[in-house]
């Protein structure tokens, strides 16, 4: 349903914000990040940017928990005005708001190159699995703001970007265990050569470059102060976070591909996958690891690296075609990415006009399928799910802001890769 223009609002991490409203985002596992300001713009896009701190003219500037920028002692607000942020208690230890720490034993399926990063924010503990970079030194050292050890001199994960950097919204709060899929970590302060700006993005061929594995995906788990338990589901000895889906593993049957379970806070909800009665081909085939039969041949060739249960489903979620058009003229590139939906029956076209690497304009058009068919230059590039499209649009809102003020070369291409659906390494959803 269309939002009436008099009621435009922004959605950010499942919350509604009014046009003009400003806030600091919650970014797991850091919690409330005071050094990032977000604003809801008139067209319903969320724009987040890093706070620029002025130079302070004193020898010992003071850091205040709820303020981003350091201040000179004589310019501090009076003590009675101070915002008192709630502390957190975890495993018998009290942590102050904003404090980072390492936890053990939260994730049963933690890989050897992963560690559990936690932070205290406004009384809640946020923990995530962080994939650590491969270390190339004999004696790595611990650093205060990361559970990963680093080689001395390496740039560890930090909020200290160059001034004015725009930070992308971590678009998908519903964390998944296919760790390297479609999530944005805060970029490292010093990027390795060739490291994608969207570390979670896959290449078109579905290959994950080694350099990309360094920046792992953070999986959210919220531990409420009162209840002392994680918002996780445990199934067959594996821990799944809220919103994550999997096929159950039953002793007598092994992995049941035709049942899809989802973790809803701490309760697992399972439903049967319904296969189509009719297929677009004469002899659909059963494939190991897939619930529904699939049509052999063309589809796989057209869309490499993708695996659908049938014509329109991926891991139990409906897929929709994505089209792309790139037009270059007079040093200006117009790139259009279009998603065709059934409900409502329309095509959402995202139009980017880029000149010399600077985004001239970005907007979204909604047109009927009939009208879309008459537009030239579009070609089918992939099929995607609504949840991946949501990640795409949220990332897009960020880079539309970022690329309008500085040169962007590959940001949009990298973001488009989010739409490509991949099998996870073991072939399961």
């Amino acid at each position: 349903e269309q939002v009436k223009h008099s009621e435009t609002y922004c959605m950010f991490q499942d919350k509604k914000y009014r046009v003009g409203e400003r806030w600091h985002p919650y970014l797991e596992p850091y919690g409330l990040v005071y050094c990032v300001n977000c604003i809801c713009s008139e067209n319903g896009n969320v724009l987040c940017s890093r706070v620029r701190c002025p130079n302070v003219h004193c020898l010992s500037p003071v850091h205040i928990p709820h303020l981003c920028c350091p201040r000179c002692p004589d310019s501090l607000p009076p003590v009675n005005n101070k915002v008192t942020s709630k502390s957190c208690e975890y495993n018998g230890t009290t942590y102050q708001h904003g404090e980072l720490f390492v936890a053990e034993g939260l994730f049963q399926n933690r890989q050897p190159n992963q560690c559990t990063q936690c932070s205290c924010s406004e009384g809640n503990v946020y923990c995530g699995l962080k994939t650590c970079p491969k270390l190339t030194c004999a004696f790595p050292v611990s650093v205060p703001d990361s559970c990963c050890r680093v080689c001395r001199g390496d740039g560890e994960l930090s909020w200290e970007h160059s001034d004015g950097d725009i930070f992308r919204q971590p678009a998908n709060r519903e964390a998944r265990h296919s760790y390297h899929r479609s999530h944005y970590d805060p970029p490292p302060s010093r990027q390795a050569g060739g490291l994608s700006r969207f570390p979670g993005a896959r290449s078109h061929r579905g290959a994950l470059m080694d350099s990309q594995q360094a920046s792992g995906t953070i999986v959210q788990i919220v531990i409420n102060n009162k209840h002392k338990h994680g918002q996780v589901c445990v199934s067959n000895g594996k821990t799944y976070s809220h919103g994550e889906s999997w096929h159950p593993n039953l002793r007598a049957f092994g992995i049941v591909e035709c049942v899809l379970c989802t973790c809803n806070v701490t309760k697992q909800e399972c439903k049967k996958i319904h296969c189509p009665n009719r297929y677009p081909c004469k002899y659909p085939q059963k494939i190991d690891g897939k619930c529904c039969k699939v049509c052999p041949g063309k589809k796989a060739k057209e869309l490499p690296g993708q695996s659908f249960d049938n014509k329109g489903y991926f891991c139990g979620e409906e897929t929709m075609p994505v089209y792309e058009s790139v037009f270059m003229e007079d040093g200006e590139t117009t790139r259009k990415i279009a998603l065709e939906t059934e409900r409502p029956p329309q095509v959402e076209v995202h139009v980017w006009t880029i000149r010399k690497g600077i985004l001239q304009h970005f907007h979204i058009e909604k047109i009927s399928k009939r009208m879309f068919e008459e537009l030239p230059h579009f070609k089918l590039v992939t099929r995607t799910t609504l949840s991946q499209w949501k990640i795409f649009t949220e990332g897009e809102a960020q880079i539309s802001q970022m690329c309008s003020s500085r040169v962007c070369r590959t940001e949009l291409e990298d973001l488009v890769k989010v739409l490509y659906l991949e099998r996870s390494e073991k072939g399961h959803c």
Partner: antibody, heavy 121, light 107 residues
């Protein structure tokens, strides 16, 4: 704010041609389709065609295919419509219209004031 | 081409009355219908887009409804300043087409 500026009137001879202009301001010109619409006295609106200023992609109403030619000049953020072989049937008000805030490509939410074309000998 | 048929051609209403304007499409156009208001000697103004979405700044006495082939513009309590021609248009397919318009007179 968004504005589409059109000249007020043109008086022309039958058989001649005219190039109507529409200067856009207040938004990024290359972003939104520019439509052209014809309105004759005591008659409804007729869509002539539209042009995407970013890549000059055009769509015409078949009825106006040989009558109208749509172009743009990105450097001056101006859209043009050339009308050829004018007859009295071409006497009308011609509007340029763009959509900016409606998000539906065919909803024209900004209109020029219209150029009144009179073809008379 | 898709033909948009508006009815009635004209109507005269008193201030405060409820007005219902009809627009029928010759084929299914989904919800790709817009309504425009054109006051004498002025350019058209967008009132409703996507069949039911009120455009920015349009008073809430104007409501659009319908889908597929039948569309309605309702003015819940007509005002003197609503004297105008009302056009419906489809953007489901090229060429875009408009209805012939309904002239609303206020007594």
């Amino acid at each position: 704010q968004v504005q589409l500026q059109q000249p007020g009137a043109e008086l022309l001879r039958p058989g001649s041609s005219v190039k109507l202009s529409c200067k856009a301001s207040g938004y990024t010109f290359t972003t939104y389709w520019m439509h052209w619409v014809k309105q004759r006295p005591i008659q409804g609106l007729e869509w002539i065609g539209n042009i995407d200023p970013s890549d000059s992609e055009t769509h015409y109403n078949q009825k106006f295919k040989d009558k109208a030619t749509l172009t743009v000049d990105k450097s001056s953020s101006t859209a043009y419509m050339q009308l050829s072989s004018l007859t009295s049937e071409d006497s009308a008000v011609y509007y340029c219209a763009s959509y900016y805030g409606s998000s539906y490509v065919g909803s024209m939410d900004y209109w020029g004031q219209g150029t009144s074309v009179t073809v008379s000998s | 081409n898709i033909v948009m048929t508006q009815s009635p051609k004209s109507m005269s209403m008193s201030v405060g009355e409820r007005v219902t304007l009809s627009c029928k499409a010759s084929e299914n156009v989904g919800t790709f219908v817009s309504w425009y208001q054109q006051k004498p000697e002025q350019s058209p103004k967008l009132l409703i887009y996507g069949a039911s979405n009120r455009y920015t700044g349009v008073p809430d006495r104007f409501t659009g409804s319908g889908s597929a082939t039948d569309f309605t513009l309702t003015i819940s309590s007509v005002q003197a300043e609503d004297l105008a021609d009302y056009h419906c248009g489809q953007s489901y397919s090229f060429p875009l087409t408009f209805g012939a318009g309904t002239k609303l007179e206020v007594k």
